[in-house]
Structures are given as structure tokens and as C-alpha cells.
Interface confidence: low
């Protein structure tokens, strides 16, 4: 029986240029986390294996940065980095946990007003 | 308007120490995640701690053990105390907060204060 919860850092807007950590934190289970992934859409950006350590993706090595702890840092953000990320925690017994967060870049002139994004 | 100045850099000897601070204007410190990330010459920014509103901290395996993150809800500022400093540890070093007690860090950064280690 699965009875875990994944609380992650929600949705976030962060400035063009800038850098930012997505967060997730897997509670309310004693299940072993063996893997982590970090993924945006459809896109494989790293890999955290508790035997193996991190792996990042390739075509996102100069900008993705591992931790902090389990979570992953995304550096020089451009607007096309907005969108859904999810973390996805692979554990023994229960099995696999999702979170997901959605990310907004914006630009510079519009984050230095405040301005943040929200789902109604 | 929200605002993260830092102070506290300077020249230091190797196995020296030296605290920064960041005081956080427009905000508390206590309801927003904190944290500091670095900038060697010639390198891209790296993340090197931070704090969260429910007082956890998180730090790259380079500086673990030898710095420490810690805020101070009274004064409203954000601590990053570095002990035996290394060479490598030379660069700018940057306060980040956040716009909401719900996101990450880095999408409100400080002016950055230098960090020098050298004999």
C-alpha cells in the first residue's frame, strides 16, 4: 500500500538569466528511495541513484546542477524553460511517487516588479 | 520592492574564515526559502547552501562541513559563515531569495560580495 506524499516547491516564477532550485521531498513513508528522477515534459534532464549517484542528461549538462540533496538546480534560465517539471521517485516497496511543480521564466523587466505566476 | 544586500567579504587567508551576511529588505526571512550560490572568474554560477522557512538547510558537497547557512529572524538576515577556506573558494558570492514562501530560490539575487582567498 502506498502511503507516502510528495511535497515539492509548487509553482515557481523565476527571472531570465537567473537560477533557481526545484525541490521535492517524499514524506509519510518508511519505502527506500533507490532513484529520483528529474524530468521536464517529456525530457529526461537527470538521474539521482542511491547506489550510482547523479547523472545528468547530456544536452542539459551546462545548465542543470545536482542538489541541493535530492533536488536539482537550473542555471542561465531562458523563457523557454517554463513549463512542468516533475520529480518521480522510484522506491521499494511502494513504488513509484510523482511530484510536479510548473516553472515560469519571465523576463527581466517583469520579474523586477514582482510579478509571479499563479493557477487560478 | 524586495530587496538582498550582502556584506562581509574580503581577503582571507587559506584555513582563514569569514562570515557573510544578507539582510533582506521588503520581506522576512522567516517565510522564504534563503540561500547563497558563488561565481568564480570565468565560471557559471554554483549553488552553495541554503535555508528553508522550516529551517532546513542544504549544502554542495564541496563546502559540506566547512560552512555553515543560518538566518536570524529578528535582524532579518541570512548567515553564511565559511570556515577553512580554500583557494578554490575565490569568487562572488551572492545572496538569493525567492518571490513567494512556495518557490525555490534564484529569482531575486544581491549585488554579490567577493570573496578572496590568497596568501
Known amino acids: 500500500m502506498m502511503t507516502g506524499t510528495i511535497e515539492t516547491t509548487g509553482n515557481i516564477s523565476a527571472e531570465k538569466g537567473g537560477s533557481i532550485i526545484l525541490q521535492c521531498h517524499l514524506s509519510s513513508t518508511t519505502a527506500q528511495v533507490t532513484q529520483v528522477n528529474w524530468e521536464q515534459q517529456d525530457q529526461l534532464l537527470a538521474i539521482c541513484n542511491a547506489d550510482l549517484g547523479w547523472h545528468i542528461s547530456p544536452s542539459f549538462k551546462d545548465r542543470v546542477a545536482p542538489g541541493p540533496g535530492l533536488g536539482l538546480t537550473l542555471q542561465s534560465l531562458t523563457v523557454n524553460d517554463t513549463g512542468e517539471y516533475f520529480c518521480i521517485y522510484h522506491t521499494y516497496p511502494d513504488g513509484t511517487y510523482t511530484g510536479r511543480i510548473f516553472l515560469e521564466v519571465l523576463e527581466s523587466s517583469v520579474a523586477e516588479h514582482g510579478a509571479r505566476f499563479q493557477i487560478p | 520592492e524586495v530587496q538582498l544586500v550582502e556584506s562581509g567579504g574580503g581577503l582571507v587567508q587559506p584555513g582563514g574564515s569569514l562570515r557573510l551576511s544578507c539582510a533582506a529588505s521588503?520581506?522576512?526571512?522567516?517565510?522564504?526559502?534563503m540561500g547563497w550560490f558563488r561565481q568564480a572568474p570565468g565560471k557559471e554560477r554554483e549553488f552553495v547552501a541554503a535555508i528553508t522557512s522550516s529551517g532546513s538547510t542544504y549544502y554542495a558537497d564541496s563546502v559540506k562541513g566547512r560552512f555553515t547557512i543560518s538566518a536570524d529572524n529578528s535582524k532579518n538576515t541570512a548567515y553564511l559563515q565559511m570556515n577553512s577556506l580554500k583557494p578554490e573558494d575565490t569568487a562572488v558570492y551572492y545572496c538569493?531569495?525567492?518571490?513567494?514562501?512556495?518557490?525555490?530560490?534564484?529569482?531575486?539575487w544581491g549585488q554579490g560580495t567577493l570573496v578572496t582567498v590568497s596568501s
Open positions: 538569493a531569495s525567492s518571490y513567494s514562501s512556495s518557490s525555490g530560490l534564484g529569482d531575486i
Open positions: 521588503g520581506r522576512t526571512v522567516s517565510s522564504h526559502a
